[in-house]
Amino acid sequence: TPEVWVQVRMEATELSSFTIRCGFLGSGSISLVTVSWGGPNGAGGTTLAVLHPERGIRQWAPARQARWETQSSISLILEGSGASSPCANTTFCCKFASFPEGSWEACGSLPPSSDPGLSAPPTPAPILRADL
């Protein structure tokens, strides 16, 4: 069964700057990744970035840099200035659309006890939705 993992880290240098990393553990071909915050995409969440493996990347403030880390994982840096900046308990979600598995989404937030610069290991987060 495919799984999605989400890792959220607060940068030590900028306490209101976050890095979100997401990955897909499955054998299928990824066709699209959508990163949102405030809840799952399409369920109250606001899209931060959409990444297509070949067509390109679209991102919106406060996202600063979205990129593919590998063929099955992505990272997104959020800059934390202004009213739309994230806070420590913000939920971030990643939805991977893949063939033939369908869509798989997981969410994560900053670990409650984490110090700046530290992060939880990138273990698979609970899968919230699987649209097959």
Partner: antibody, heavy 114, light 113 residues
Framework: EVQLVQSGAEVKKPGSSVKVSCKAS????????IEWVRQAPGQGLEWIGE????????NYNEKFKGRVTFTADTSTNTAYMELSSLRSEDTAVYYC???????WGQGTLVTVSS | DIVMTQSPDSLAVSLGERATINCKSS????????????LAWYQQKPGQPPKLLIY???TRESGVPDRFSGSGSGTDFTLTISSLQAEDVAVYYC?????????FGQGTKLEIK
């Protein structure tokens, strides 16, 4: 198949504003950004910016910041581009596009002339 | 901004012959993480909007004839039409799909010799 249908041609005076609409059908309007691109007569393509209709998040080409505004109405699947302080150099065909420029509207000719 | 430069500006090729258009970017369009090049090619005929032909430097958009092919990596890319047809007369544009703002080449006008 996504279809984008734009509003008709406009003739405007210098200093005025123009608002171009782009109605989408056949796809998920709020999931992908609507891009705006213009093409002056006999010239190349120039990206103006984009809006993500679901959240109204926008990105603008620095060249147009302060003069262009994007809005979107998800109830009618329509995106809008308003360009203000028009000058003769803004005479161009304005296109909306979606899904990484895979789908395009037919274009709207905006002529700025005194 | 990434500057896209196409060559030649215009090109005349006989029907059935090969047409080659080059595109050079001022910065690499290669995403090192997934080894994909974010470059697209468009065809525009008079009075029509551009039509996406190629994305990811080499992937043909659905419905595009297989005589169109894209190649290249990093900063140097090529669009090839293997056997020119009359309906291929148009202006062709390359586009940076790697970073904001998306920028286009100046265009290459393709005509029949």
């Amino acid at each position: 198949e996504v279809q984008l249908v734009q509003s008709g041609a406009e003739v405007k005076k210098p200093g005025s504003s123009v608002k171009v609409s782009c109605k989408a059908s056949g796809g998920t309007f709020s999931s992908f950004s609507i891009e705006w691109v213009r093409q002056a007569p006999g010239q190349g393509l120039e990206w103006i910016g984009e809006i993500l209709p679901g959240s109204n998040s926008t990105n603008y080409n620095e060249k147009f910041k302060g003069r262009v505004t994007f809005t979107a109405d998800t109830s009618t699947n329509t995106a809008y581009m308003e360009l203000s302080s028009l000058r003769s150099e803004d005479t161009a065909v304005y296109y909306c596009s979606s899904y990484w420029f895979a789908y395009w509207g037919q274009g709207t000719l905006v002529t700025v002339s005194s | 901004d990434i500057v896209m430069t196409q060559s030649p500006d215009s090109l005349a090729v006989s029907l059935g012959e090969r047409a080659t258009i080059n595109c050079k970017s001022s910065q690499s369009l290669l995403n090192s993480g997934n080894q994909k090049n974010y470059l697209a090619w468009y065809q525009q005929k008079p009075g029509q909007p551009p039509k996406l032909l190629i994305y990811g430097a080499s992937t043909r958009e659905s419905g595009v004839p297989d005589r169109f092919s894209g190649s290249g990596s990093g900063t140097d890319f090529t669009l090839t039409i293997s056997s020119l047809q009359a309906e291929d007369v148009a202006v062709y544009y390359c586009q940076n799909a790697h970073s904001y703002p998306p920028t286009f080449g100046q265009g290459t006008k393709l005509e029949i010799k």
